[in-house]
């Protein structure tokens, strides 16, 4: 805390400009009017204040706005935003996408900080849902943003927002998240034709059920192995050898290299060996010829 001292004669700040970087901390405290600072916040970003000086400027704003800063000030915080704590940010009411963009720009190129996470949380809660423009903005700054949300949070994403999602935005999503996103993507892209649809839906397929994979296998999509390896194991297991062959097209040869990894390994164990042999890939581990397969889950459902 800076002691309260009178401003020296002739040093009272009439505007926020570079002359203030020559002020000692106590002079800034004594000579800069908080209301002046609030109205000229946009100038701060161009001026190289030291961290210590920024602490004083923040303190002045905190005194002026103990209940939280108004959006007119927040939008122009510039690099003073880096001085804010999550507790400070929780007092804010940020409704403008322009304000959000301005503050994300300050943090650009860095990992998502607790401050940014709090800001985004406040913004999204204020809007009630993750609309397309917000999602566009957030994934542009933080490609992994979508995958940082819980399945519950993702449920508030409207299908229309899915158009803003790029494949790299889903790189770190786990199956539970894709389970939520896939139906939304399916809905969003439903009016597209076969090949275009597959291009768009491909990165969401880690949440696809068996029946959708069966449908895709009828459309000559030529799914690559990387996509296949990300499919839900429980969705892959019921697929027949013929269906997998159709689904992968020329990429079916890649199964050999992945035969020890899930979901390929588990799928092989469920197929008849003579069916696997028709692929000519030397896949081993299928059910030997002459053995009867009982689907116990089906039997339990019937009893």
């Amino acid at each position: 805390e800076v002691e309260k001292t009178a401003c020296p004669s002739g040093k009272k700040a009439r505007e926020i400009d570079e002359s203030l970087i020559f002020y000692k901390k106590w002079e800034l405290e004594a000579c800069v009017d908080a209301a002046l600072l609030a109205t000229q916040m946009d100038r701060v970003n161009a001026i190289p204040f030291t961290y210590e000086q920024l602490d004083v400027l923040k303190h002045k704003l905190d005194e002026l706005y103990p209940q939280g800063y108004p959006e007119s000030v927040i939008q122009h915080l510039g690099y003073l935003f880096l001085k804010m704590s999550p507790e400070d940010i929780r007092k804010w009411n940020v409704t403008s996408l322009e304000t959000l963009k301005a503050l994300l720009e300050v943090n650009k190129g860095h990992e998502m900080s607790p401050q940014v996470a709090t800001l985004i949380d406040r913004f999204v809660k204020g809007r009630g849902q993750l609309d397309k423009d917000t999602l566009d903005t957030l994934t542009a700054f933080y490609p992994g943003y979508l995958c940082s949300l819980s399945p519950e949070e993702l449920s508030s994403v409207p299908p229309s927002s899915i158009w803003a999602v790029r494949p790299q935005d889903l790189d770190t999503c786990d199956p539970r998240q894709l389970d939520v996103l896939y139906p939304k993507a399916r809905l969003a892209f439903q009016n597209m034709n076969g090949s275009e649809y597959f291009v768009k839906i491909q990165s969401f397929l880690g949440g696809a059920p068996t029946e959708d994979l069966k449908a895709l296998s009828q459309q000559n999509v030529s799914m690559d192995l990387a996509t296949f390896m990300k499919l839900r194991t429980d969705a892959v297991l019921p697929l027949t050898v013929a269906e997998v062959q159709k689904l992968l097209g020329p990429h079916v040869e890649g199964l050999k290299a992945e035969e020890r990894h899930r979901p390929v390994r588990d799928w092989i164990l469920r197929q008849r060996q003579d069916d696997l042999d028709t692929l000519g890939l030397g896949l081993q581990g299928g059910i030997p010829n002459g053995y009867l397969v009982l689907d116990l889950s089906m039997q339990e459902a019937l009893s």
């Epitope: 570079e18 970003n45 690099y79």
Partner: nanobody, 112 residues
Framework: QVQLVESGGGLVEAGDSLRLSCVVS????????MAWFRQAPGKEREAVAS????????IYADFVKGRFTISRDYEKNTIYLSMNNLKPEDTAVYYC?????WGQGTQVTVSS
């Protein structure tokens, strides 16, 4: 992002001169105030001189007036700090800054 790289520091004797350079890359500077700061061991960082890139306005700290000169070269995106009649108390790490961006600093040591 803006990158600032200082150079020109060194060990000199009292009364000697040095010229520090700061090359800026990564973004246009029109909207920035650029400045030289210094930090002596155990002391707070303090502003030495500033130059407003768009208006050309120059400001100096009282303790360097008449001895130090800040200047700029548009074409080279560089600012300079010419330091004459150096004193032992000028010993510090000198930093260049543009808006929120700071360089890593260059050491100036003035022996008596």
């Amino acid at each position: 992002q803006v990158q600032l790289v200082e150079s020109g520091g060194g060990l000199v004797e009292a009364g000697d001169s040095l010229r520090l350079s700061c090359v800026v890359s990564g973004r246009t500077l029109e909207s920035y105030v650029m400045a030289w700061f210094r930090q002596a061991p155990g002391k707070e960082r303090e502003a030495v001189a500033s130059i407003n890139w768009s208006s050309g306005r120059l400001i100096y700290a009282d303790f360097v007036k008449g001895r130090f000169t800040i200047s700029r070269d548009y074409e080279k995106n560089t600012i300079y700090l010419s330091m004459n009649n150096l004193k032992p108390e000028d010993t510090a790490v000198y930093y260049c800054a543009a808006g929120r961006y700071w360089g890593q600093g260059t050491q100036v040591t003035v022996s008596s």
